[in-house]
């Protein structure tokens, strides 16, 4: 099966790599614009130069193209705790990331929020914090894992999943309560 090509892809595939078909004259192949530039005017004829102009401040193109406008630079989302790793240039978009000892949680494909890595208090680090994943903690005896924090078994209620992990402690508490003096 042949994959469905959009009109632009169909037109481009007629020309050799690095060129595109003239929108008004399909017998002419124009040279694409370099990254950091955009198409101002199509080439007037075969072998003649395409009129490409440099992107203005606040915009970019990251690959060769025949776009009529440069793309707007992304802005890091402060409300998501994002910080700017590198600023936008004419040929590269802004790179956003998180601070040290933070990880990214992706709410959607292109939107992430920064969260502090768990410190595993009352436990040990099973897997270190990574760019896109929080620390994985293992809790000490007498503690259970709740929302990636080690919580004392004294906070374990019978209905919670912690009962298996905290069973010895719960039994001990019961035992001390039940053992009366004769």
């Amino acid at each position: 099966l042949v994959p469905h090509l959009g009109d632009r892809e169909k037109r481009d595939s007629v020309c050799p790599q690095g060129k595109y078909i003239h929108p008004q004259n399909n017998s002419i192949c124009c040279t694409k614009c370099h990254k950091g530039t955009y198409l101002y005017n199509d080439c007037p004829g075969p072998g003649q130069d395409t009129d490409c102009r440099e992107c203005e401040s606040g915009s970019f193109t990251a690959s060769e193209n025949h776009l009529r406008h440069c793309l707007s630079c992304s802005k890091c989302r402060k409300e998501m705790g994002q910080v700017e790793i590198s600023s936008c240039t004419v040929d590269r978009d802004t790179v956003c990331g998180c601070r040290k000892n933070q990880y990214r949680h992706y709410w959607s494909e292109n939107l992430f929020q920064c969260f502090n890595c768990s410190l595993c208090l009352n436990g040990t680090v099973h897997l270190s914090c990574q760019e896109k994943q929080n620390t994985v903690c293992t809790c000490h005896a007498g503690f259970f894992l709740r929302e990636n924090e080690c919580v004392s078994c004294s906070n374990c209620k019978k209905s919670l999943e912690c009962t298996k992990l905290c069973l010895p402690q719960i039994e001990n508490v019961k035992g001390t309560e039940d053992s009366g003096t004769t």
Partner: nanobody, 117 residues
């Protein structure tokens, strides 16, 4: 078939509280980010809050931060929104949505919250 059914809306006085619930079915609830989105009368949609599959990560819009709390119970396939210190500007239809950020693929039918004295 994915179904999201909100409940818990109603009329409340300013400063009051409400707890919204969303019963989910037809997909593996515990594997997805979930959100609350609202639409005030005559306004656009506002992403209010989101929670990660584990519940470890949460997001709140500035307009509700410190007043609203999102939570989930994966054993019951239910999403919650505890709304405290309600204001007139919180009046809206509240929708439960599968996904978050710029990617909501399913919505509930909504529940109306009216804050008025």
């Amino acid at each position: 078939e994915v179904q999201l059914l909100e409940s818990g809306g109603g009329l409340v006085q300013p400063g009051g509280s409400l707890r919204l619930s969303c019963a989910a079915s037809g997909f593996t609830f515990s594997a997805y980010n979930m959100s609350w989105v609202r639409q005030a009368p005559g306004k656009g949609l506002e992403w209010v809050s989101a929670i990660s599959p584990s519940g470890n990560e949460t997001y709140y819009a500035d307009s509700v931060k410190g007043r609203f709390t999102i939570s989930r119970d994966n054993s019951k396939n239910t999403l919650y929104l505890q709304m405290n210190s309600l204001r007139a500007e919180d009046t809206a239809v509240y929708y439960c949505a599968k996904g978050a950020g710029e990617a909501f693929d399913y919505w509930g039918q909504g529940t109306l919250v009216t804050v008025s004295s």
